[in-house]
């Protein structure tokens, strides 16, 4: 990526890392308002299976692994990108490496959920406090999950689907920070590992993923009031290990793997019309990206 002048800060969709033939170090940002892509400062170490989030206007890249011709190393790293300076800086590492991790943010704290280290599938969860640059373990999930989708709604952390080392999962669970405990919620209609999970309009959406046989294009959403999952319109492309985020009331899904191809496709979901549309293409196909949106 370029190391030139820092871009103007706006509401951009950032995509970090990913995988195509090997783990990638790209950081790119898409501006939905004008359809342009920015090439930004590379990650210091290539990573796929990472997660991205934004706290206090800074972008964090969490976990993943570096799968390269030289070897394969799961990552415990937390790195922070400042859009004002276009620079990455390392933060305190997690207690364990976590590939195919999920993350969520509650009250400015980053929760790192599940993931794998070699053949170990974690149920452990840890919380990062940016002001102290410290990680602390919290209550473990009830289920081991890699390729887990994580979202935060009403200050509760949801872990959805994934793979426990034996089975792909349709189960989901919810973490209550005040009680430091997890509780199962209604299972999805569909087994999904490597799905994209996000929150829009008081619902948790689970898009795509892999059911142990095939990549999926189906999408379902969980209504916390009725505690039910309902299908919405499917994506145009089947995809697992995709990136997902919400920007101005719409869901964006980025890349992923369709069983044959590493996708460059970016689709956008409009909840008002219950439709998906192709909005742009990434500069190259990839799976396992970390995605987040800058705050205004």
């Amino acid at each position: 990526g370029s190391m030139g002048h820092a871009p103007k800060v706006g509401r951009l969709i950032y995509t970090a890392g990913g995988y195509f033939r090997q783990s990638l170090s790209y950081l790119e940002a898409y501006n939905p308002s004008d359809g342009t892509w920015l090439d930004l400062a590379d990650l210091q170490v290539p990573r796929s299976g990472l997660a991205g989030c934004v706290v206090g206007g800074l972008l964090y890249a969490v976990g993943g692994r570096n799968n390269s011709p030289d070897g394969n190393t799961d990552s415990s790293a937390l790195d922070c990108y400042n859009p004002m300076t276009n620079q990455w800086s390392p933060c305190a590492p997690m207690s364990v490496p976590r590939n195919r991790i999920g993350v969520g943010v509650i009250d400015g704290h980053i929760y790192a959920v599940g993931g794998s280290h070699g053949c170990i599938h974690h149920n452990s969860v840890e919380r990062y406090e940016p002001e102290r640059d410290e990680w602390h373990l919290v209550a473990p999930m009830l289920t081991r999950r890699i390729g887990v989708g994580v979202a935060v709604l009403n200050r509760l952390l949801y872990a959805v689907g994934g793979f426990d080392g034996t089975n792909r999962l349709n189960s989901a669970e919810c973490y209550y920070p005040e009680r430091n405990e997890w509780r199962m919620i209604t299972a999805m209609n569909t087994i999904r590992s490597g799905a994209g999970v996000c929150v829009l309009h008081n619902c948790i959406y689970a898009a795509g993923g892999y059911d142990g046989q095939d990549q999926l294009n189906s999408v379902e959403r969980y209504d916390v009031e009725t505690e039910t999952w309902t299908f919405v319109a499917p994506m145009k492309h089947r995809r697992s290990a995709l990136g997902i985020t919400v920007h101005q009331g719409r869901i964006y899904v980025l890349g992923g793997y369709d069983g044959h191809t590493f996708l460059d496709s970016v689709e956008c979901y409009d909840p008002d019309t219950d439709t998906w549309s192709e909005v742009t293409r990434m500069t190259s196909g990839r799976s396992g990206v970390g995605v987040a949106v800058t705050m205004e």
């Epitope: 299976g49 070897g71 070699g118 170990i120 892999y210 142990g212 095939d214 069983g259 799976s287």
Partner: antibody, heavy 120, light 107 residues
């Protein structure tokens, strides 16, 4: 009945290329990790490469990284191992196997193997 | 890379004998060890996974155990069809590695 049948082996000169095929029946290769393992004459087993059906990620032994490429064509239910820049030390029987997951133990649905001989 | 040191490299035994084969990992591999049987000209067959779990269809005379970084395959009563070469494999971390094999021959 679950079966894997390897083909494509043969005699090749150093520096040459071969593409091995692994045709699966009785299960969908999209539902399993696929691994290649090799065995040099009179020697032990060596893991070579794996492909993850969920993410598309691949892993390679350092001895073959950059020279070999594992892939899968789900429409043909067949996995492949493209071998370039072959060396004498690549001479072996090559087996493909179905795995429960990317790092997992190989199942016993291994084929009978295909012999690759690299010699001038 | 994690080394899997297998012993003995060969052994002679009679039908009905109890046979024990050991693999020692050079570092912790948790319980991510599998055992295979291979007969001449054939592909290896999975016997044991996760150190002690019997793979489906494998006779119960085969068992596996773990003590720290030491892993053991036991055949409680050797049968004629058990004369073969046995390999251990760790899949704890990249790259997956095998032991050098133990050939079980007829005494």
């Amino acid at each position: 009945e679950v079966q894997l049948v390897e083909s494509g082996g043969g005699l090749v000169q150093p520096g040459g290329s071969l593409r091995l095929s692994c045709a699966a029946s009785g299960f969908a290769i999209s539902a399993s990790s696929i691994h290649w393992v090799r065995q040099a004459p009179g020697k032990g087993l060596e893991w070579v490469a794996s492909i993850d059906p969920e993410t598309g990620e691949t892993l390679y032994a350092k001895s073959v990284a950059g020279r070999f490429t594992i892939s899968a064509d789900t429409s043909k239910n067949t996995a492949y191992l493209q071998m370039n820049s072959l060396r004498a030390e690549d001479t072996a029987v090559y087996y493909c196997a179905r795995g429960e997951w990317f790092y997992g133990a190989l199942s016993d649905y291994a084929g009978q193997g295909t012999l690759v001989t690299v010699s001038s | 890379d994690i080394q899997m040191t297998q012993s003995p490299s060969s052994l002679s035994a009679s039908v009905g004998d109890r046979v024990t084969i050991t693999c020692r990992a050079s570092q912790s591999v948790s319980s991510a060890v599998a055992w295979y049987q291979q007969k001449p000209g054939k592909a290896p067959k999975l016997l044991i996974y996760s150190a002690s779990s019997l793979y489906s269809g494998v006779p119960s005379r085969f068992s596996g155990s773990r003590s720290g970084t030491d892993f053991t395959l036991t055949i409680s009563s050797l049968q004629p069809e058990d004369f073969a070469t046995y390999y251990c494999q760790q899949s704890y971390s990249f790259p997956s590695t095998f032991g050098q094999g133990t050939k079980v021959e007829i005494k």
